[in-house]
């Protein structure tokens, strides 16, 4: 039973109120890296002039009407769009990355919805049709999160272009004060 989506709007109808937890992280898959290992040092790394801790995950507020075919909400709803880069300060403020936290070609951290809220809206329809009551799922907060196989590209496209893959060269990843002590913290953080 997936979410039933409005035809003309990215906002989704939801069956009930509540918070929707992030799916679990991908299991370790023993993939090896597929990269040239012994090339010379590149002349520079992208973003070397910029402090990696500068990037942030922003919450942009948008107000819009919810539509369902010819019907439109009586009042506009305010929701968040997640935007921005995910730098290490946003990922795990007290961490340093060691091999334990390394992932092949990732993990890919994106600025994506963290929590959702449900709002009841009344849809007004033309032609004297009776108003419809609906619950819609709206983004309530954003967070830098590790993408998993559960976050597919069609899901990502709704987060806006800035939420798409961080620019090439350096992708945030995880590490810890004492890695063992922080493992649970890391696993719960995303």
């Amino acid at each position: 039973q997936g979410w039933q989506a409005f035809k003309n709007d990215a906002t989704e109808i939801i069956p009930e109120l509540g918070e929707y937890p992030e799916p679990p992280p991908e299991l370790e898959n023993n993939k090896t890296m597929n990269r040239a290992e012994n090339g010379g040092r590149p002349p520079h790394h992208p973003f070397e002039t910029k402090d990696v801790s500068e990037y942030s995950c922003r919450e942009l507020h948008f107000t819009r009407y919810v539509t369902d075919g010819p019907c439109r909400s009586a009042k506009p709803v305010t929701e968040l769009v997640c935007s921005g880069q995910c730098g290490p300060a946003r990922l795990l403020p007290n961490a340093i990355g060691r091999g334990k936290w390394w992932r092949p070609s990732g993990p890919d951290f994106r600025c994506i919805p963290d929590r959702y809220r449900a709002q009841r809206v009344q849809l007004l329809c033309p032609g004297g049709e009776a108003p419809r009551a609906r619950k819609v799922r709206l983004v309530a907060s954003c967070k830098c999160k590790r993408l998993t196989r559960f976050h597919n590209q069609s899901e990502l496209k709704d987060f806006g272009t800035e939420a798409a893959r961080p620019q090439k060269g350096r992708k945030p990843r995880p590490r810890a004060r004492s890695a063992k002590a922080n493992q649970a913290e890391l696993e719960n953080a995303y």
Epitope: T32, S53, I96, G99, W101, R103, G106, R175
Partner: antibody, heavy 126, light 111 residues
Framework: QVQLQQSGAELVRPGTSVKVSCKAS????????IEWIKQRPGQGLEWIGV????????NYNEKFKIKATLTADKSSSTAYMQLSSLTSDDSAVYFC???????????????????WGQGTSVTVSS | KIVLTQSPASLAVSLRQRATISCRAS??????????MHWYQQKPGQPPKLLIY???NLESGVPARFSGSGSRTDFTLTIDPVEADDAATYYC?????????FGAGTKLELK
């Protein structure tokens, strides 16, 4: 080219402090880690701690938590290690080394200490 | 804490022969099929020099006679053939987790 230049040898009295510097050049200082390593004469290598100059995050070896204080100055691309309440056990050569943080993906992924300072000899003697 | 046990403690090898140094970790240092074990060479009065990173990758500028192998807990550094310039102490090191640890070192001498 990448270089880590450490401060000169120190002869210090027991009970005092010393601050060793490690000036980085030839790469983006804030995008890599600086590790600190101790080597007593004729002995092996012992990890003291690490600092991420970009975020200021520090991890210490439990053994050196009280002894060492790591800092970094982004404006001068210099990392520092202060050793306090010095005793003869602290007489050693101290190295700084550049390391790679697994939070990031690099074009050429090493994730090891690929550049080292020349070492700073600290002798504690009355 | 991951303990690295290096063997032998010292090794005497003739020129142009093969030298093999072993490093055993008290627990796995692998993540997604990549081993966070590295090998360094140190000569008296000098800082350590990175030879092999992530178990088997030759660092830029290091002669191809150095090679590394192994995974999880068992790793090997091989020098073949040994040259006069290779007389030094060799250390394995893990950065799978903090605290970073080094092996006790293997002193390579030439016969």
């Amino acid at each position: 080219q990448v270089q880590l230049q450490q401060s000169g040898a120190e002869l210090v009295r027991p009970g005092t402090s010393v601050k060793v510097s490690c000036k980085a050049s030839g790469y983006a200082f804030t995008n890599y880690l600086i590790e600190w390593i101790k080597q007593r004469p004729g002995q092996g290598l012992e990890w003291i701690g690490v600092i991420n100059p970009g975020s200021g995050i520090i991890n210490y070896n439990e053994k050196f938590k009280i002894k060492a204080t790591l800092t970094a100055d982004k404006s001068s691309s210099t990392a520092y290690m202060q050793l306090s309440s010095l005793t003869s056990d602290d007489s050693a050569v101290y190295f700084c080394a550049r390391d790679w943080d697994t939070f990031y993906s690099y074009e050429r992924e090493v994730y090891a200490m690929d550049y080292w300072g020349q070492g700073t000899s600290v002798t504690v003697s009355s | 804490k991951i303990v690295l046990t290096q063997s032998p403690a010292s090794l005497a090898v003739s020129l142009r022969q093969r030298a093999t140094i072993s490093c055993r970790a008290s627990e796995s240092v692998d993540s997604y099929g990549n081993s966070f074990m590295h090998w360094y060479q140190q000569k008296p009065g000098q800082p350590p020099k990175l030879l092999i990173y992530r178990a088997s990758n030759l660092e830029s500028g290091v002669p191809a006679r150095f090679s590394g192998s192994g995974s999880r807990t068992d790793f090997t550094l091989t020098i073949d053939p040994v040259e006069a310039d290779d007389a030094a102490t060799y250390y394995c090191q893990q950065n799978y987790e903090d605290p970073l640890t080094f092996g006790a070192g293997t002193k390579l001498e030439l016969k």
